[in-house]
């Protein structure tokens, strides 16, 4: 389960992701494709600080449906 | 071809720093990050930190913090690590090495290395 | 941080042998498990990443398996040039931390 406001890096943050992100998907691309800049951005701001939830589903692909 | 060439090797006295350079071909540089690992001799491998090559923004183990300071120069594509108070411990050959994507799959081309002795 | 055990170290094998290295992460690590050969005076060189997904030109007599903390690396026919020493490196969480190698001998 997710931990707020810590580092995550490598696999825990691609699996902190899918866990927060569920059936949205999340912008990462297949392995050894070219980087994005969207994806450059969470690895700077989760992995080389900390980061929190919200700022985590901001990079969910597709907003959570509202009930 | 993708290649990383890294800078010759060093003699350092302890208690000085030392910079080894690492230029970067046959790719985009600033699409990659890259890592910094070393190897004491006959040992295994520990790794140092990580360079964003795009921001220079960096990530440094513990261990080196305060004393390992990552750089990188877009314009010749190269990153550049230097270690200060220099130890007789941190004898080692030196790899840069590129990170094949988010620090979850590996590091897929290396650099040849770089010896740095730490000697009175 | 993460250690990571590797066993046996030393391995004597024969060529057409078929060899397996096996990785014990202190924690789950699920499959973020990468595979490293190293020739002496060389750098390493990326085998398996992701615990068993082939890198482009490695050859498909290596393979790798688990999840987990449980991992191995199999060579299925050992060629002379596989003579080497292999690591493994988990990429689970930084700092990233590698095994301490297994040397593979000949007999």
């Known amino acids: 389960a997710y931990r707020p406001s810590e580092t995550l890096c490598g696999g825990e943050l691609v699996d902190t992701l899918q866990f927060v992100c569920g059936d949205r998907g999340f912008y990462f691309s297949r392995p050894a494709s070219r980087v994005s800049r969207r994806s450059r951005g969470i690895v700077e701001e989760c992995c080389f600080r900390s980061c929190d939830l919200a700022l985590l589903e901001t990079y969910c692909a597709t907003p959570a449906k509202s009930e | 071809q993708v290649q990383l060439v890294q800078s010759g090797a060093e003699v350092k006295k302890p208690g000085a720093s030392v910079k080894v350079s690492c230029k970067a071909s046959?790719?985009?540089?600033?699409?990659?990050?890259m890592h910094w690992v070393r190897q004491a001799p006959g040992q295994g491998l520990e790794w140092m930190g990580i360079?964003?090559?795009?921001?220079?923004?960096?990530s440094y183990a513990q261990k080196f913090q305060g004393r390992v300071t990552m750089t990188r120069d877009t314009s010749t594509s190269t990153v550049y690590m230097e270690l200060s108070r220099l130890r007789s411990d941190d004898t080692a050959v030196y790899y840069c090495?590129?990170?094949?994507?988010?620090?979850?799959?590996?590091?897929?081309?290396w650099g040849q290395g770089t010896t740095v002795t730490v000697s009175s | 941080r993460i250690q990571m055990t590797q066993s046996p170290s030393p391995l004597s094998a024969s060529v057409g042998d078929r060899v397996t290295i096996t990785c014990r992460a202190s924690?789950?690590?699920?499959?973020?498990l990468n595979w490293y050969q190293q020739k002496p005076g060389k750098a390493p060189k990326l085998l398996i990443y992701?615990?068993?997904s082939l890198q482009s030109g490695v050859p498909s007599r290596f393979s790798g398996s688990g999840s987990g903390t449980d991992f191995t690396l199999t060579i299925s026919s050992l060629q002379p040039e596989d003579f080497a020493t292999y690591y493994c490196?988990?990429?689970?969480?930084?700092?990233?931390?590698f095994g301490g190698g297994t040397k593979v001998e000949i007999k």
């Open positions: 090495a590129r990170d094949v994507q988010w620090l979850a799959y590996g590091m897929d081309v």
């Open positions: 046959g790719y985009t540089f600033t699409s990659y990050y």
């Open positions: 360079i964003n090559p795009s921001g220079g923004s960096t």
């Open positions: 924690q789950s690590i699920s499959s973020y």
């Open positions: 992701a615990a068993s």
């Open positions: 490196q988990q990429s689970y969480s930084t700092p990233l931390t």
